[in-house]
Interface confidence: low
């Protein structure tokens, strides 16, 4: 299945964190979503085989990439209180 690390993260405002996602074996696509109490579930970004394919409601302070082994990282910088949320990764062929 899809593996995300870390499972939990507590940090301070202004900091930068990296969330990692390993897709299911053989899957080429990785999707990142943010679920917050006030905004609900929002699509952030989609990568296919290392290339950005679609961008959703992703802030300039957030960036992502997908590596040749297809794992992906979501970088959140200059963190604000409003960034407190669940971050989901999904994968597909």
């Amino acid at each position: 299945g899809v593996t995300q690390t870390p499972k939990h993260l507590i940090t301070a405002t202004g900091q930068r964190v990296t969330l990692r996602c390993s897709p299911r074996s053989g899957d080429l696509s990785v999707y990142w979503y943010q679920q917050s109490l006030d905004q609900g579930l929002q699509f952030l970004i989609h990568y296919y085989n290392g290339e950005e394919r679609a961008k959703g409601n992703i802030l300039e302070r957030f960036s992502a990439q997908q590596f040749p082994d297809l794992h992906s990282e979501l970088n959140l910088s200059s963190l604000e209180l409003g960034d407190s949320a669940l971050y989901f990764c999904a994968s597909s062929v």
Epitope: G26, D27, L28, N49, E51, P68, D69, L70
Partner: antibody, heavy 122, light 107 residues
């Protein structure tokens, strides 16, 4: 037909900069990553990293962080490699290469440029 | 990084002969090995990927075999245009790494 055509040979002194280009034709440029590979005289091939032609995001191998910059002129289907503060050990042939889009385990190169020889000498 | 060891470094043969080039990985790379041909002033040419899959347009006299750590490129019935440098490359994991090369010369 698919081609990657690289710029001509370069002669530079230590400390100077050089910018190499790689013009792609025969395919949709933004559908494939462009990689750079170094080959020092009499040596083997060493992968330098790649640039995502869709987003412009570069990724560098550990040994090529710092003085090496990958960039794009997407409208011209061209990828560039700039090397600053040149050193004698940068003397080499630099290849651009296209990676096939096969996904998992897909870090291979199905089309290559002809290579550019860069000489760094005082 | 995965280290790739190629052998032999040099190989002399005549047209019509068959030759084999070996490549050994420092750890298992499953089946994910590519072979390239290099000639001066020409773009490198992908011959084989996934250890044994022939790239489109490459003559069937080229074949690849092996999995895990040991791989072989075989050329049966050498043609004059086959002489040059050959490199293996693992495409199992980041970063991609190459063997040191094998020079195939005319005997």
């Amino acid at each position: 037909q698919i081609q990657l055509v690289q710029s001509g040979p370069e002669l530079r002194e230590p400390g100077e900069s050089v910018k190499l280009s790689c013009k792609a034709s025969g395919y949709t440029f933004t559908d494939y990553l462009v990689h750079w590979v170094k080959q020092a005289p009499g040596k083997g091939l060493k992968w330098m990293g790649w640039i995502n032609t869709y987003t412009g995001t570069p990724t560098y191998a550990d040994d090529f962080e710092g003085r090496f910059v990958f960039s794009l002129e997407a409208s011209a289907s061209t990828a560039n490699l700039q090397i600053s503060n040149l050193k004698n050990e940068d003397t080499a042939t630099y290849f651009c290469a296209r990676s096939w889009r096969r996904g998992l385990r897909g870090i291979g190169f199905d089309y290559w440029g002809q290579g550019v020889f860069v000489t760094v000498s005082s | 990084d995965v280290q790739m060891t190629q052998s032999p470094y040099n190989l002399a043969a005549s047209p019509g002969e068959s030759v084999s080039i070996n490549c050994k990985a420092s750890k298992s790379i499953n089946k994910y090995l590519a072979w390239y041909q290099q000639k001066p002033g020409k773009p490198n040419k992908l011959l084989i990927y996934d250890g044994s899959t022939l790239q489109s347009g490459i003559p069937s006299r080229f074949s690849g075999s092996g999995s895990g750590t040991d791989f072989t490129l075989t050329i049966r019935g050498l043609e004059p245009e086959d002489f040059g440098l050959y490199y293996c490359q693992q495409h199992n994991e980041y970063p991609p790494t190459f063997g040191a090369g094998t020079k195939l010369e005319l005997k």
